[in-house]
Interface confidence: low
């Protein structure tokens, strides 16, 4: 099973059980020496073919089972013949086994009374026969194979007794590996639910960072929701009530300068007609009659037209009006107006705190209360019981096992001693007939007579009797062990370790009412007295194989459900009903009538109506009708041109008197004009299409007041759920964690699991049955071939 | 039971520092928000502000900013208020005050505070 | 800032009587709270909500009103009523009090 998921809880924030690290090794790995053992496998399979008989072992065990057993019965006699038919191989092979150990006694006795009464070989023929040399290569190759035949089935002897040794050796740190786990299985639980009783805070700490951060997780929220359709109102608002503040100060500075224009108009125009004055008193001068003067006073006197001031600067009207407008509609404070737009939207948060102080406190008063809820829940769980006697019984069995060990050890050297003996013993028949081999071959002379050859081939033919001897002597003895062992490890790989490792044998444990005619599940009977409930030894094994915690594996569900203690719902539940307790009220601001009715006399205050033109067509004309500096300069040539005395003297003092004009009163009203140039600009820009714009921003206004009346509850609403999901999401997530975790993780039941693979598939099947199968097979090979070496031999 | 009980009366010359406590018991101090409300020698109440006892985050009413410094101390469950120099109109009774939601709903019995040269 | 003005500033009645002190909002509110303060005790919450009694209040105290325009009703009025009412907002940030109305029993 994977981890739990909860929709509200985040992805990312998983919980995970620090993982347990066990010695033992899952699986036993043989070596090279398993070729030899699935050799061995191999020969077993062809001897006993057929498949794991289930039901014949149930009846068997069924039969045991019973005090009195009638052979008698048919159900009996069939029951028996099953297992004939199963073990069918097994007996022919016993069959002819026992041949074996009845006939070569009996044959080697006669031979040797034959032999002894010359009448079995050994006599010396004079002449050869014809075919004489070739069947002798012919038995000396044959003997030759056979006998490497047998020192193969001697090599296995001797590897497989090797390796009951060595594993045998190894027996005691496999035991302690398997108990070391077992032992860190019982110390780790309690660590693993402290573990997830520490979660706990992990969660709660969680909860309360969003608990105490509600003004701006939940606050927040709520704000970025109405923010979208509010501030950009605002904005404009804003912007309008800048805009506002621009239109006075143009106007002002608009009304200010057209003050000083007509003042500074009127003073232009004046100081023009008293220099006109004094230009047309000096051109009275006697010498504008005589020529050529009179030509130069005729110019100066026709330019005097041109000595006028613009009169439309004085007839531009003022803006009173639309200033008083202006700063009426300035008289409410639309800036402070949407600065508390903006406040009451930016108190949000902290108003969702001041608000919820109390449902805060009651979540987190619940929120403790479910942190001791689960401490309770997790301390009546009953794996502690199941471990606790689990204990006991894992000490007995260490003691037992440590007690036992060393006569086990002694055993093995017994084993040990006898396979070498054994080994031994064949080695020196096989010995024999390598030497006699060898010996004939080498002493062999094809010239000489019987009663002439040499000492070494005589030699060869005695340590090949020697070999035949001894064959006969012990193969017999040798055929009986092999016939036990074969018939012992045959069985048990068969019956136990390959349906072990099949999980066959697990089905025929888990029979109804096999093991206790009163319990239908042994397992539950067995740890409960609830023995309805089904748990059988293949589920307990796979689960505890896959490393399934003890709660699942065992079921103990049936006796303490975690879900109904722990029972999520009722603690979200009261999580939910302290948050629906939530209740925010928010006020946001946004105008009113006063900040309307700004806006609306803002539109109607005259300025879109200003004819701006004739402001414009003034700024860009001359303030008096003529360049009064070229005019000066113009009228200093023409004096100059007069002879000297008072008329040109007097024409230069006005020239003087022109630029003194321009200077003091022509450039002011330039200043002026440029001044009310800009302030023009800008009262055009605001006013163009200003009816529109407000219509539009009022028209924002409602939409967005209509969203505040209609939708604020809403989202607050939905606020509160998405917040409220949250924080029922984090524990919603925890406590599927651990229903998760102590159902499926907690107090992993692998090393049992381990210690029984360990016990059945390692130590029974791979440490004893599988180097005694193979000491069988080569041992038996070994005897069965010294019958044709025999042969060949004599 | 709620109770929020304020330090001693305090007489002080213009220019000093006082600080006054307010220590809460008979709730979980960090689940209220706590706030100092001023009451000058037979005049009406006035809010300075609120004092966040979950972050320790103090705000101020625009009268009250500059002199005036709230904290906490959260383990002992003790707000305080600080004013540093002090100035004659200081004079006033200082309260203590939990809110829930919208009001104040327990108060502590004040501390006088007199500046006088 | 919403100010609240109160009126009377002070009254007098007679154990008995009907007192009805008035509390208006410079813009309008939500919620009104109405507190008593003795001399040289803090303020004590009287009302919450407009119209809510705070437990341990006599039930002869009560409160009304909507928008800007909120009432705190003594009825009967009694001796131990002596005391400064006053009304407050927090429905706009800051939260404000009114002036205080000075009851006072003949």
């Known amino acids: 099973g994977g981890q739990p998921s909860s929709t509200d809880a985040p992805k990312a924030w998983n919980y995970e059980l620090p993982a347990t690290n066990y010695e033992t090794q899952d699986s036993h790995k043989a070596g090279p020496i398993g070729i030899l053992f699935e050799l061995v496998h191999i020969f077993l399979y062809v001897v006993q073919p057929r498949d794991f008989p289930e039901d014949t072992l149930r009846k068997f065990l069924q039969k045991a089972y019973e005090s009195k057993i009638d052979y008698d019965k048919p159900e009996t006699v069939i029951l028996g013949l099953k297992i004939v038919y199963y073990e069918a191989g097994i007996i022919l092979c016993c069959v002819l086994g026992l041949l074996f150990i009845i006939l070569m006694p009996l044959v080697g006795y006669f031979f040797c009374m034959c032999r002894c009464c010359n009448k079995c070989g050994g006599e010396m023929h004079q002449r050869q026969k014809e075919n004489g040399p070739f069947l002798r290569k012919c038995f000396a190759i044959s003997l030759l194979v056979i006998c490497i035949i047998i020192s193969i089935g001697i090599f296995y002897g001797f590897v497989a007794n090797h390796q009951v040794r060595t594993r045998i050796k190894r027996s005691r740190k496999l035991a302690d590996s398997n108990f070391k786990d077992l032992r860190t299985l019982l110390n780790e639980t309690p660590e693993q639910i402290k573990y997830i009783l520490a979660q706990y805070n992990t969660t709660k700490d969680k909860a309360f960072t969003d608990l105490n951060s509600i003004n701006s997780v939940l606050g927040g929220g709520i704000l970025d929701r109405l923010r979208p359709n509010i501030i950009p109102v605002l904005d404009e608002i804003k912007s309008m009530a800048t805009a506002i503040k621009e239109t006075k100060e143009a106007l002002e500075n608009m009304n200010s300068t057209l003050k000083s224009l007509h003042q500074q108009s009127t003073q232009l125009s004046s100081s023009l007609t008293s220099v006109k004055t004094s230009l047309r008193s000096s051109l009275n001068d006697p010498l504008c009659l005589v020529h050529p003067s009179s030509e130069t006073c005729n110019s100066i006197r026709l330019s005097l037209s041109q000595l006028n001031s613009n009169p439309e600067l004085r007839q531009l009207p003022p803006v009173d009006a639309e200033l008083d407008n202006v700063n009426n509609v300035l008289r409410t404070d639309l800036d402070g107006l949407v600065q508390q737009g903006y406040q009451s939207l930016n108190d949000i948060p902290d108003r969702v705190q001041r608000q919820t102080t109390t449902v805060v406190a009651g979540i987190k008063r619940v929120l403790n209360s479910i942190g001791s809820d689960i401490d309770n829940v997790t301390q009546r769980l009953p794996i502690q019981d199941i471990l606790s006697a689990f204990s006991v019984y894992v000490n007995n069995t260490e003691s037992y096992i440590h007690r036992n060990l060393p006569t086990l050890e002694e055993y093995d050297s017994y084993w040990w001693l006898g396979g070498l003996v054994i080994c031994s013993l064949l080695t020196l028949i096989v010995i024999f007939y390598y030497l006699g081999l060898l010996c004939g071959v080498c002493g062999y002379d094809r010239h000489a007579t019987p009663t002439t050859r040499g000492c070494v081939s005589n030699t060869g033919g005695v340590f090949l009797m020697v070999g035949v001897g001894l064959s006969f002597l012990f193969c017999w003895i040798l055929m009986i062990i092999v016939v036990l062992t074969f018939v012992f490890g045959a069985n048990v790989e068969k019956l136990i370790c390959e349906p072990y490792t099949s999980k066959e044998l697990f089905r025929v444990l888990d029979t109804p009412y096999l093991l206790n005619e009163d319990w239908e599940y042994y397992l539950s009977g067995k740890l409960f007295n609830k023995s309805k409930m089904k748990l059988t030894f293949e589920q307990v094994y796979s689960d505890c194989k896959k490393n399934r915690g003890t709660y699942g594996t065992l079921h103990l569900q049936n006796s303490f459900n975690i879900s109904e203690h722990l029972n999520i719902n009722e603690h979200t539940g009261s999580i939910s009903s302290e948050l629906e307790s939530l209740k925010v009220n928010l006020n946001i601001f946004l105008l009113g009538a006063a900040g309307r009715k700004n806006l609306q006399d803002f539109a109607a205050c005259g300025i879109d109506r200003m004819n701006y033109d004739s402001y414009l067509a003034q700024t860009g004309k001359s303030p008096a009708g003529v360049n009064l500096l070229s005019f000066a300069y113009d009228l200093e040539a023409k004096a100059n041109s007069l002879p000297p005395g008072n008329l040109r003297n007097s024409l230069k003092r006005d020239a003087q008197t022109i630029k003194t004009i321009h200077q003091q009163r022509v450039l002011p009203i330039e200043q002026s004009l440029s001044t009310l140039y800009q302030s023009v600009k800008i009262l055009q820009r605001t006013g163009n299409g200003l009816l529109e714009r407000v219509t539009r921003i009022l028209a924002s206004l409602d939409f967005a007041q209509n969203f505040i009346t209609n939708n604020t509850s809403s989202v607050i609403i939905e606020e509160t759920k998405k917040y409220g999901r949250t924080i029922i999401g984090y524990f919603e997530h925890y406590l599927q964690w651990i229903e998760f975790s102590i159902s499926e993780k907690v107090a992993s039941c692998k090393p049992v699991a381990t210690a029984l693979d360990t016990a059945v598939d390692v130590f029974l099947c791979s440490y004893i049955i599988d180097p005694l199968n193979l000491f069988w097979f080569g041992i038996g090979k070994a005897t069965v071939f010294l019958l044709p070496a025999l042969i060949f031999a004599v | 039971e709620v109770k929020l009980v304020e330090s001693g009366p305090e007489l002080k010359k213009p220019g000093e520092t006082v600080k006054i406590s307010c220590k809460a018991s008979g709730y979980t101090f960090t689940d209220y928000s706590m706030h100092w409300v001023n009451q000058a020698p037979g005049k009406g109440l006035k809010w300075m502000g609120w004092l966040n006892t979950e972050t320790g985050e103090p705000s101020y009413a625009d009268d009250f900013k500059g002199r005036f410094a709230f904290s906490l101390e959260t383990s002992a469950s003790t707000a305080y208020l600080q004013i540093n120099n002090l100035k004659n109109e200081d004079t006033a009774t200082y309260f203590c005050?939990?809110?829930?939601?919208?009001?104040?709903?327990?108060w502590g019995q004040g501390t006088t505070l007199t500046v006088s040269s | 800032d919403i100010v609240l003005t109160q009126s009377p500033a002070i009254m007098s009645a007679s154990p008995g009587e009907k007192v009805t002190i008035s509390c208006s909002a410079s813009?309008?509110?939500?919620?009104m709270y109405w507190y008593q303060q003795k001399p040289g005790q803090p303020p004590r919450l009287l009302i919450y909500?407009?119209?809510n009694l705070e437990s341990g209040v006599p039930a002869r105290f009560s409160g009304s009103g909507s928008g800007t325009d909120f009432t705190l009703n003594i009825h009967p009025v009694e001796e131990e009523d002596a005391a400064t009412y006053y009304c407050q907002q927090y429905h706009s940030y800051p939260p404000t009090f009114g002036a205080g109305t000075k009851l006072e029993l003949k």
């Open positions: 005050a939990t809110d829930y939601g919208d009001y104040f709903d327990y």
């Open positions: 909500l407009v119209s």
């Open positions: 813009s309008s509110v939500s919620y």
